[in-house]
């Protein structure tokens, strides 16, 4: 019998500010590049070490941006995304969501070691 | 590839006034940061003034004395040092770093001192007030 992978979805709001390198971060996606199939959302692709978004410690790579400073990026071209980004000023305000993949057992089995529940 | 190389140290006396170049090549100076930092015999390496395209940042220890600029066709930063003084003496540095940011911007803000934040150094420039 097969682990069953299951995903842990959380949605969080970071506020980084602007520093020598920026917010320390890269982004793709958009509706012109979807990076995730089906999903035209803006994703973390990349976190710069020492910027300011590994110093704050909550951003991932793979985090799913949803909105900046209260704008909504669904449905935006890349570039759209990136002018958004642009215009939000010395302090960021990020909504996002994490998705942690969580690893079941196969049903019905208890793993030693593991809570009783 | 990036690289920064710094000018103008030397000796001068009290009193007496340097200006420091800081030539940068492999990317255009007008949207990265540039920083200078400063470290004398035995001490650890100081933050002096941090300048981008849209703020400029000086030490308490040289405000109304140095003054940081940038020219942009020449892709060099200056810092104008003005009334030195013997504990000015140090080896001066420049630095900048690496822009990771969904728009490409980047400014000093107000940690810009964090030697960790920069990427890149020059050689250094020795300066002596003596």
């Known amino acids: 019998m097969n682990g069953r992978v299951d995903y842990l979805v959380t949605e969080e709001e970071i506020n980084l500010t602007r520093g020598p390198s920026g917010l320390g971060f890269n982004i793709v996606g958009g509706t012109d590049q979807q990076y995730v199939s089906n999903d035209s959302g803006i994703y973390v692709s990349r976190i710069k070490e020492n910027g300011a978004a590994a110093l704050d410690g909550r951003l991932q790579e793979g985090d799913k941006i949803l909105s900046v400073n209260g704008q909504d990026l669904k449905n935006l071209l890349h570039q759209d995304a990136v002018d958004l980004f642009r215009n939000a000023g010395y302090a960021v305000s990020l909504r996002v969501q994490h998705r942690l993949q969580v690893q079941n057992g196969p049903i019905g089995h208890r793993g030693e070691g593991d809570p009783s529940g | 590839e990036v690289q920064l190389v710094e000018s103008g140290g030397g000796l001068v006396q009290p009193g007496g006034s340097l200006r420091l170049s800081c030539a940068a090549s492999g990317f255009t100076s007008d949207y990265y940061v540039i920083s200078w930092f400063r470290q004398a015999p035995g001490k650890e390496r100081e933050g002096v003034s941090c300048?981008?395209?849209?703020?400029?940042y000086y030490a308490d220890s040289v405000k109304g004395r140095f003054t940081i600029s940038r020219d942009n066709a020449k892709n060099t930063v200056y810092l104008q040092m003005n009334s030195l003084k013997p504990e000015d003496t140090a080896v001066y540095y420049c630095?900048?770093?690496?822009?990771?940011?969904?728009?490409?911007?980047?400014?000093?803000?107000?940690?810009?001192?964090?030697?960790?934040?920069?990427?890149?150094w020059g050689q250094g420039t020795q300066v002596t007030v003596s």
């Open positions: 300048i981008s395209s849209s703020d400029t």
């Open positions: 630095a900048t770093a690496a822009i990771w940011d969904p728009s490409g911007l980047a400014v000093c803000g107000s940690s810009w001192y964090r030697r960790g934040w920069w990427d890149y």
